[in-house]
């Protein structure tokens, strides 16, 4: 969001109806609010970066975000038997990323034609309160997660009722956190009509300039919060996983179980580094600067690194395949384009023909249904 | 160069309306904004309105619904029209080239057109 | 709508003096402001925008400070065609004009 300068006809300074026009003269349009941008910030608005880029980078999220992600919350709900913390978290997460995915479409199109906006003030409010929601759910549930796996390896126990239904009461408190933690993103005015580029963006062009150092301490408490907070726990909870595996014993199953570990320590630090570490620094330098100076230099780097933390939803399907063994078989069998059934099916053959031959080569994975490393 | 040449002077019956034209040379009209400016005798400056290069237009909430701010890409010239005339309109009416963007300031000026209302 | 309140009325200095012209606004514009020099039977010229961005084809002699709700517009050597009416503009939130500083020989 750029800061908008706002020429309000209504006497006030700073509110106005933007969409609302009073009359049409030759082929332009008289508004009765403009809000009108910086020319760094315009050519942003009508350059390559924010209408080809983006898009592309959007339409890649989309394509792989809404199917792995779909198939991620059918295996978690329907073909995972055992609900344990993990497969909660994970289809939370899987479900946080296709709320946000599946308004894509709008936001391509959106990039696509300049940077205008034609599908009204409420459904911006909706892509805009799911796209901040998707990310700071990403950062809770992947925090649960992980703080979860620490747990696992720490107190190796057995499933037990409670646990999943602790765990479903920290799903909900998130779901209900994250949209008390939006409701900001609903309420304020996102759709702007910039005259001089006759388009009017979502998001883009901050309406109110009194709202600048609303948005800053806004984007700041949840840097902050929502943010470091979990950011420290994650990585305090990997810290902790990495000592405890290094000192255990060494067989096979254990070598195993270390290295999908670290695979998923690393995938989870792609993921920040990445989609959540840039985006938060840069939300609040971004306002910080519009506070104090009236426009942000940072703004090109600010829309880039708000797109790159939608590839949450692309990398957190890998981390569905380092935790959940169900979620594995059926990625492995998807991209392979067969059916668990059949897979199921000729594993029972080879396990028959194994044991009437007695001697064979034949390795072939469980089906189980069991959900750690 | 950058020029505007504006319209002569007018006189006008209270009531009536006056059309001021602004010519604009060394830019083009499509590529940059033109605002209005009036200045009554012996008083400051006072903004009216703004017409981008595209036809989009604004106005200050004092003038809306009486001032008409249009632009003929062809000929290069923007017009300013200004309806009910009163006698607190006697002013100089300038136009001044804008670049349409925040970080820009009205960086050239008509010589300005004085409207006299008088009965 | 943002005020513009421009200080002294009038300013009486000879040529060579340094002149110090104060503009201030009703509330926080950051570094939108712009001075302008308008002589008598002409139109206003461009000074300085941005607070402190000197136009071009304006003498060094002009200079512009200030940001937030208080800015300064300083000739350091008044030479005698530096005698004039001073507005200040500001363009961050609507366009206003300051009710403009006279500069007068002594």
């Known amino acids: 969001t750029i800061q908008g300068t706002n020429r309000s006809s209504k006497g006030r300074s700073l509110i106005g109806k933007v969409d609302g026009t009073s009359h049409v003269t030759g082929k332009g349009v008289t508004v009765e609010t403009v809000f009108s941008v910086d020319e760094f910030s315009a050519s942003v608005l009508t350059g390559k970066l924010t209408t080809v880029f983006l898009p592309i980078v959007y339409t890649i999220v989309f394509v792989v975000g809404l199917p792995s992600n779909g198939m991620a919350l059918w295996v978690f709900l329907f073909r995972t038997k055992k609900k344990h913390p993990a497969v909660i978290y994970m289809a939370n997460l899987a479900l946080a990323d296709l709320l946000s995915v599946i308004w894509f479409p709008l936001k391509i199109a959106y990039h696509i034609h300049g940077n205008n906006w034609i599908y009204g003030e409420a459904l911006c409010n909706v892509l805009i309160g799911f796209f901040y929601g998707n990310m700071y759910c990403s950062i809770l549930f992947m925090t649960c997660l992980s703080v979860q796996r620490y747990w696992v390896i720490v107190n190796p126990m057995g499933h037990s009722r409670k646990k999943a239904n602790i765990a479903i009461g920290i799903s909900l408190a998130i779901w209900l956190l994250i949209l008390l933690v939006t409701i900001p993103l609903y309420v304020v005015k996102q759709t702007i009509f910039i005259p001089a580029l006759n388009i009017t963006t979502c998001h883009d062009v901050l309406p109110e300039q009194l709202l600048v150092g609303d948005m800053f301490n806004y984007f700041l408490s949840l840097a902050i919060g929502v943010f470091l907070f979990p950011a420290f726990l994650t990585a305090s909870a990997y810290v902790l996983m990495i000592r405890m595996l290094r000192s255990s014993a060494m067989d096979e199953n254990s070598e195993k179980k270390r290295k999908r570990a670290i695979k998923l320590i690393v995938t989870v630090l792609a993921m920040y580094l990445i989609c959540f570490t840039p985006s938060n620094l840069l939300l609040v330098v971004h306002y910080f600067l519009i506070k104090s100076q009236g426009q942000s230099h940072v703004y090109a780097l600010y829309i880039v690194a708000l797109c790159l933390s939608t590839l949450n939803s692309c990398i957190d399907p890998f981390v569905y395949y380092f935790v959940s063994h169900d979620f594995r078989d059926h990625a492995k069998n998807a991209l392979l384009c067969r059916s668990v059934r059949t897979v199921k099916q000729m594993q029972v053959s080879l396990t028959s023909k194994k044991h009437s031959r007695k001697s064979s080569s034949y390795s072939s994975s469980s089906t189980t249904v069991k959900t750690s490393y | 160069q950058v020029q505007l040449v504006q319209s002569g002077a007018e006189v006008k019956k209270p009531g009536s309306s006056v059309k001021v034209s602004c010519k604009a040379s060394?830019?083009?009209?499509?590529?940059?904004?033109i605002s209005w400016v009036r200045q009554a005798p012996g008083q400051g400056l006072e903004w009216m309105g703004v017409?981008?290069?595209?036809?989009?237009?604004y106005y200050a909430q004092k003038f809306q619904g009486r001032v008409t701010i249009t632009a003929d890409e062809s000929t290069s010239t923007a017009y300013m029209e200004l309806s009910s005339l009163r006698s607190e309109d006697t002013a100089v009416y300038y136009c001044?080239?804008?670049?349409?963007?925040?970080?820009?300031?009205?960086?050239?000026w008509g010589q300005g057109t004085l409207v006299t209302v008088s009965s | 709508e943002i005020v513009l309140t421009q200080s002294p009325a009038t300013l009486s200095l000879s040529p060579g003096e340094r002149a110090t012209l104060s503009c201030r606004a009703s509330?926080?514009?950051?570094?939108?402001l712009d001075w302008y020099q308008q002589k008598p039977g002409q139109a206003p010229r461009l000074l300085i925008y941005?607070?402190?961005s000197l136009a071009t084809g304006i003498p060094a002699r002009f200079s512009g400070s200030g940001s937030g709700r208080d800015f300064t517009l300083t000739i350091s050597s008044l030479e005698p065609e530096d005698f004039a009416v001073y507005y200040c503009?500001?363009?961050?939130?609507?366009?206003?004009f300051g009710g403009g500083t006279k500069v007068e020989i002594k």
């Open positions: 001044a080239r804008w670049r349409g963007y925040k970080d820009y300031p009205f960086d050239y």
């Open positions: 060394g830019f083009s009209l499509s590529s940059y904004a």
């Open positions: 017409i981008w290069g595209n036809g989009n237009t």
């Open positions: 509330q926080n514009i950051y570094k939108w």
């Open positions: 941005n607070a402190y």
């Open positions: 503009q500001q363009h961050n939130s609507g366009w206003t």
